[in-house]
């Protein structure tokens, strides 16, 4: 595949980074579905800068990321340590509370209004970001 | 404007079935969680049940459980509630109303509510 | 289930005077995302409840500003600065954070 040198139409550009925002909600799966369709990922925060940057593009909405534990230990969706990179979460979060009636326990991140980090039941249908970057071999073939 | 009108209700026997109705119009059905809510004759408010946008998930009431389905079709914009093995303490007016706020945020109560209509179990 | 009790369970009030609706929750309403999720709705006569105030203390648009809510964890307070003739029904305080989402009996707010 070719390497991606520009972010797709209505895709935003930063830090050799594409990202989209949706304006729907989708339960988690059905986010990170619809992002790996884009050939791109639910969005892996890194760094302050990049929280930032987010957090000003979704506003005070509750908002997908790719940060799970459905398997056991929180991961990034993208392979990023999780142990040793950036965190933002909430006070007392992630606490896997349980109370809230649907089922299980909360195994997927969110941002909130403030735009620090919760885990929240991963069926509930928030917004979401998709990231892809642009260093990246895109899976389209290349133009002859 | 946004209306939701519901429909359907009636005189039934115990043990029997009913479903209702919901016709939503005036904004965009799919994007929005929809609840059932009850009241019984001369008291409060209780919940039912609530169907998520696309109707992948569905929550109900333990007095209902097992007797009472949601449904919607988006291409109707309509909700239905099947109601079976009806007892006489079914009986209420029926509300269907939409999650409201921001109908991606399903800790949102209830903000667009329908008349209702009237169901009675009674032998 | 958590157990909402709203008191009084009426209420009556001369026109132009405030009032004032308690409600407590069974267990707090404090999500984890920072919100609290209680609800106020007022049902007139013959009608269906009308959302009032959502997420505590949050005024649905156009919803009168002689109406504020208050409160966190899981006391509440729903306020009428100075209460009008059409402010007449049934108030009830609703929380969402758990399923089964679940109301206060409710409390009858009639003018003298």
């Known amino acids: 595949g070719s390497e991606r040198t520009c972010c797709p139409v209505n895709w935003v550009e930063h830090e050799r980074s594409c990202y989209w925002f949706s304006r729907s909600g989708k339960a988690w799966a059905d986010a990170d579905n619809y992002c790996r369709l884009e050939d791109a990922h639910l969005v892996v925060v890194t760094s302050w800068e990049e929280q930032k940057f987010v957090q000003h593009h979704i506003g005070p909405v509750n908002t997908w990321m790719g940060l799970h534990d459905q398997n056991g230990p929180w991961k990034w969706v993208d392979g990023t340590d999780y142990e040793t990179g950036f965190k933002n979460w909430r006070p007392e979060q992630p606490d896997d509370w349980y109370g809230h009636g649907l089922g299980g326990g909360e195994d997927c991140a969110h941002f909130t209004d403030d735009g620090r980090w919760n885990d929240d039941v991963c069926q509930r249908p928030y917004r979401w970001v998709c990231e892809t970057e642009l260093d990246k071999a895109s899976q389209e073939p290349p133009l002859l | 404007q946004v209306q939701l009108v519901e429909s359907g209700g009636g005189v039934v026997q115990p043990g029997r079935s009913l479903r209702l109705s919901c016709a939503a119009s005036?904004?965009?059905?799919?994007?929005?969680?929809m609840h059932w809510v009850r009241q019984a004759p001369g008291k409060g408010l209780e919940w039912v049940t609530i169907?998520?946008?696309?109707?992948?998930?569905?929550y109900y009431a333990d007095s209902v459980k097992g007797r009472f389905a949601i449904s919607r079709d988006n291409s109707k914009n309509t909700l239905y509630l099947q109601m079976n093995s009806l007892r006489a303490e079914d009986t209420a007016v029926y509300y269907c109303?939409?999650?409201?706020?921001?109908?991606?945020?399903?800790?949102?109560?209830?903000?667009?509510w329908g008349q209702g209509t009237t169901v009675t179990v009674s032998s | 289930d958590i157990v909402m009790t709203q008191t009084p369970l009426s209420l009556s009030v001369t026109p132009g005077q405030p009032a004032s609706i308690s409600c407590k929750s069974s267990q707090s309403l404090l999500h984890g995302d920072g919100k609290t999720y209680l609800y106020w709705y007022l049902q007139k006569p013959g009608q269906p409840p009308q959302l009032l105030i959502y997420?505590?203390?949050n005024r649905f648009p156009g919803v009168s500003d002689r109406f504020s809510g208050s409160g966190s964890g899981t006391d509440f307070t729903l306020k009428i600065s100075r209460v009008e003739a059409e402010d007449v029904g049934v108030y009830y305080c609703m929380q969402s954070i758990q399923v089964p989402w679940t109301f206060g009996q409710g409390t009858k707010v009639e003018i003298k």
């Open positions: 997420a505590t203390s």
């Open positions: 005036g904004f965009t059905f799919s994007a929005y969680g």
């Open positions: 109303a939409r999650t409201g706020v921001d109908p991606w945020d399903y800790y949102n109560g209830m903000d667009v």
């Open positions: 169907i998520w946008y696309d109707g992948s998930y569905k």
